[in-house]
């Protein structure tokens, strides 16, 4: 039987400074149970970009409606992009536990930032 897949369809996204970047992520199953989180970079030094349950992420909004049932779309939008936001963003599925453990990561989407049009 098919195991959950994390799909990030865009290998790269280019956004002008000051605009919003949409980073797409979908999953193919509602199980295993556990949250989705977004990170910039990989490895122990990766930066948490969005965690739905905890934290304050004022520039990040979820693309899917908050009341959408059986949601498998975990795309996010990051507003007011600056050159400092450039990097590779990963959508990561966690397995619920104490603590939650990483189950599977998407392949990543590289965000590049263009100069603001004059």
């Amino acid at each position: 039987e098919e195991e959950l897949q994390v799909i990030q369809p865009d290998k790269s996204v280019s956004v002008a400074a000051g605009e919003s970047a949409i980073l797409h992520c979908t999953v193919t199953s509602l199980i295993p149970v556990g949250p989705i989180q977004w990170f910039r970079g990989a490895g122990p030094a990766r930066e948490l970009i969005y965690n739905q349950k905890e934290g304050h992420f004022p520039r990040v909004t979820t693309v899917s409606e908050s009341t959408k049932r059986e949601n498998m779309d975990f795309s996010i939008s990051i507003s007011n992009i600056t050159p400092a936001d450039a990097g590779t963003y990963y959508c990561v599925k966690f397995r619920k536990g104490s603590p939650d453990t990483e189950f599977k990561s998407g392949a990543g989407t590289e965000l590049s930032v263009r100069a603001k049009p004059s």
Partner: antibody, heavy 120, light 108 residues
Framework: EVQLVESGGGVVQPGGSLRLSCAAS????????VSWVRQAPGKGLEWVST??????YYADSVKGRFTISRDNSKNTLYLQMNSLRAEDTAVYYC???????????????WGQGTLVTVSS | EIVLTQSPATLSVSPGERVTFSCRAS??????IAWYQQKPGQAPRLLIY???SRDTGIPDRFSGSGSGTDFTLTISSLQSEDFGVYYC??????????FGGGTKVEIK
Amino acid sequence: EVQLVESGGGVVQPGGSLRLSCAASGFSFSIYAVSWVRQAPGKGLEWVSTIGADDTYYADSVKGRFTISRDNSKNTLYLQMNSLRAEDTAVYYCAKDSTVGWSGDFFDYWGQGTLVTVSS
Amino acid sequence: EIVLTQSPATLSVSPGERVTFSCRASQNVRSDIAWYQQKPGQAPRLLIYAASSRDTGIPDRFSGSGSGTDFTLTISSLQSEDFGVYYCQQYYDWPPFTFGGGTKVEIK
């Protein structure tokens, strides 16, 4: 139409075992978490166990005695109950988990339940 | 474990009356609350999820509100088929999923 049909309940002596089954239809069983919730006679609802893929979760009151499992090829959920106690006497409901937005889980469909009576 | 306290335990009401049920959580559960109706001898039925979203096919006389620790289920005009027991459930932090003790609605 989503349907959940429990079976396997009955009368068992304290210390005995019982295996409950829940046959599911009307939805893509293999991609959903499913759960068991019980209700003692005249009492409220108590969550028992949930299974995702191979990830399983239990209430403290049944941990080490009950085992939840699933067979996706048969669209069936199971609950193996060992070392049964009088306080396990209840109607056992099978329930389909649902999610909303980035959150979960609640129970959007329930079976009609199967009664387990633990008595000597 | 998050404890849900429902009040009152029993409500005696007449058809046509407005009914309000309370569910209080022992800690913040955001909007991760569901409400169920259970009639005697039947399985629970999902009414409301995400504190205020009605499930498919649920009449609009049922409404939910609240966030954080205090939640309310309201029936704007009670119908005869609405008698039964109403339970809230939190799914913010689990295991375990927890249910309130229920509020029984009986005919006055």
